[in-house]
């Protein structure tokens, strides 16, 4: 449940150095600068816990500022092998090698890592993100071509004493940024190694890792200003759940965004939105601080617990759900996007659900902490919250069984 | 500035098909849908159907879904439509327009004319 | 299919006049109505949104109301180039439809 046991050397206090080692904003993804290679080339990465590569963009591209030149790094090694991994919609391919990798607002170690080095790719890089590559921070089960490719974090834990342990503190804006703004903004903060104390309030609550390939996890019950949606759980995790700092939304299941909208629909029916908010085409606009966030509901999700028949709920605000956008043509006004989306591949807990939030990846006790994170953006009314615990039972029949195939690893 | 840039007038023969592409600049690409609609000569607007840049999810007017195709590129910010099947009553102006609060931004459009 | 039913199809007017347009969709669409001016060989350009919302830059003499099923745009004083093909749209559900469009003409 809570996290009070005693304190661990190296997993506790203050990590001052990489506070605020994030940028970015949600739409975009959040990137920390990495150096890779001897000479370093400094490069942003995005930071994604819903694939398992460490891969950079190796060459020229319309969309990239500067990228990775191996033949620059006296400590580049081929290993003469590609990967080529294909997404929903796009793909990206490249040549396998490893190179010395740091972070120089992380551990200061230094480490030999896999690196993918992007020759070729679609609809991957975005124009304007400002990130170059991607540091994919899930597990080797997911990673490509295959297993035998030991993931960045993995090949960190191994060569250094670094505990196998990150947590993440995604700061939503609240308002829309411009690319300056994004530039000079502060994102947010991944913790490697441990858990900061200034990044969150509260308790911290746990649950399980189910299956250690993405992050996976169960839901076990869903609410909508407290009504709860009474759905069979499992289809909460139809066919799997996980947490992904690589999406933008909070992504559901077919039913389950069905019936989540419906009852979002009817709490906000005070005004009458468009279809095209709800599927996330148009935009919904008030005039310049007049945003009714009373109108709209609190979402809870309930997570397993790590005791039996006990549960946590996390709730997010309107706030995390209504992404900002800017559009010039309604400039006066503040403008946002449904941030909820309809998914075919399971619940993915997306940048909406973690910006509310601390998330801590304790790979060492296979479970993910959640606290209300001190950087969230609330009204004077209503908060995010973690709370528990909740009795909830019979949440093992919650989890989806996945026929076995091969599963491709996405950021959407 | 946000502009939305179509290619140039089509002549096409009935049965034909044709693909009129629209070049978008000045704001995130992915952040924004794009329409296209349509105009005959001297008549309304007809809206065609739309496209998410970020996924390529579609959605079409029933009119048109079984001979529309909205495609996108992001590597190059172009959205395309293509109309097959094409017979003397599509002769028409067609735009693409980007989404946000209704149609905030149109292309200049784009004549196609089937004519035997 | 919601129609969205524009009157008059054109009208004259002078320079000066005060202008409106009504439209009136065939079921109730909220607030989710727009407007566009079209001048001949050119693509619409936005006016307002949201049934009163002016899009940036767009002239204050432009207004627009209602809600449910009625409503109207106002040209306060018209002025020689707001002489155009006018167009309301809903855009509460799919397929987006737009009224026939009214002609202003100079008297």
């Known amino acids: 449940e809570t996290d009070e046991e005693p304190e661990e050397p190296g997993r506790r206090g203050s990590f001052v150095e990489m506070v605020d080692n994030l940028r970015g904003k949600s739409g975009q993804g959040y990137y920390v600068e990495m150096t890779v290679g001897s000479p370093p080339q400094t490069l942003n990465i995005l930071v994604d816990t819903g694939s398992s590569n460490f891969a950079v963009g190796a060459a020229p591209h319309p969309f990239l500022h500067r990228y990775y030149q191996r033949q620059l790094s006296s400590t580049y090694r081929d290993l003469r092998k590609g990967v080529y991994v294909p997404y929903t919609q796009g793909k990206w391919e490249g040549e396998l090698g490893t190179d010395l990798v740091s972070i120089p607002h992380g551990p200061n170690v230094t480490v030999r890592a896999n690196i993918a080095a992007i020759t070729e790719s679609d609809k991957f890089f975005i124009n304007g993100s400002n990130w170059e590559g991607i540091l994919g921070l899930a597990y080797a089960e997911i990673a490509r071509p295959d297993d035998s490719l030991e993931p960045f974090f993995d090949s960190l834990v191994k060569q250094t004493h670094v505990p196998n342990l990150f947590s993440l503190q995604l700061c939503g804006a609240g308002f829309p940024l411009n690319q300056s703004e994004v530039l000079a903004s502060v994102g947010g903060s991944m913790i490697i190694g441990g858990i900061d104390h200034s990044l969150y309030t509260g308790s911290l609550w746990y649950t399980p890792i189910r299956r250690e390939w993405y992050y996976e996890v169960i839901i076990v019950r869903v609410e909508i200003n407290g009504q709860d949606l009474k759905m069979d759980c499992k289809e909460y995790n139809y066919d799997k759940s996980i947490v992904d700092s690589g999406t933008t939304n909070l992504r559901l299941p077919k039913k389950v965004f069905e019936a989540a909208v419906k009852s979002i629909k009817a709490a906000s029916s005070t005004e009458k939105f468009p279809d095209g908010f709800w599927l996330g085409e148009q935009l919904v606009c008030w005039q310049a601080g007049t945003t009714p966030w009373n109108i709209f509901p609190v979402i809870s999700l309930y997570l397993m617990g790590e005791v039996t028949n006990q549960s946590f709920r996390i709730t997010i605000l309107p706030q995390q759900y209504l992404r900002p956008v800017e559009d010039v043509a309604t400039s006066q006004d503040d403008c946002y996007k449904f941030a909820i989306s309809q998914s075919s591949t399971g619940t993915v807990m997306g940048a909406v659900i973690m910006e509310g939030f601390y998330v801590v990846f304790d790979r060492a006790r296979k479970r993910i902490g959640f606290a209300v994170s001190a950087c969230h953006v609330h009204d004077e009314f209503r908060t995010a919250a973690v709370e528990g615990p909740f009795v909830t039972l019979d949440m093992e029949d919650c989890g989806y069984n996945i026929p076995q195939t091969d599963e491709s690893t996405l950021m959407t | 500035q946000v502009q939305l840039v179509q290619s140039g007038a089509e002549v096409k023969k009935p049965g034909a098909s044709v693909k009129v592409s629209c070049k978008a600049s000045?704001?995130?690409?992915?952040?924004?849908?794009i329409h296209w609609v349509r105009q005959a000569p001297g008549q309304g607007l007809e809206w065609m159907g739309i496209?998410?840049?970020?996924?390529?999810?579609?959605k079409y007017n029933q009119k048109f879904k079984a001979r529309a195709t909205l495609t996108v590129d992001t590597s190059t910010s172009t959205v395309y439509m293509e109309l097959s099947s094409l017979r003397s009553e599509d002769t028409a102006v067609y735009y693409c327009a980007r989404s946000g609060v209704a149609f905030p931004y149109w292309g200049q459009g784009t004549l196609v004319t089937v004519s035997s | 299919d919601i129609q969205m039913t524009q009157s008059p199809s054109s009208l004259s007017a002078s320079v000066g006049d005060r202008v409106t347009i009504t439209c009136k969709a065939s079921?109730?669409?909220?607030?989710?109505v727009a407007w566009y001016q079209q001048k001949p060989g050119k693509s619409p350009k936005s006016l307002i949104y949201s049934a009163s919302h002016r899009y940036s830059g767009v002239p204050s003499r432009f207004s627009g109301s209602g809600s449910g099923t009625d409503f109207t745009l106002t040209i306060s004083s018209l002025q020689p180039e707001d002489f155009a093909t006018y167009f309301c749209q809903q855009y509460n559900s799919y397929p987006y439809t737009f009224g026939q469009g009214t002609k202003v003409e100079i008297k």
């Open positions: 000045g704001y995130t690409f992915t952040n924004f849908w």
């Open positions: 079921q109730d669409v909220g607030r989710n």
């Open positions: 496209i998410d840049p970020s996924d390529s999810y579609t």
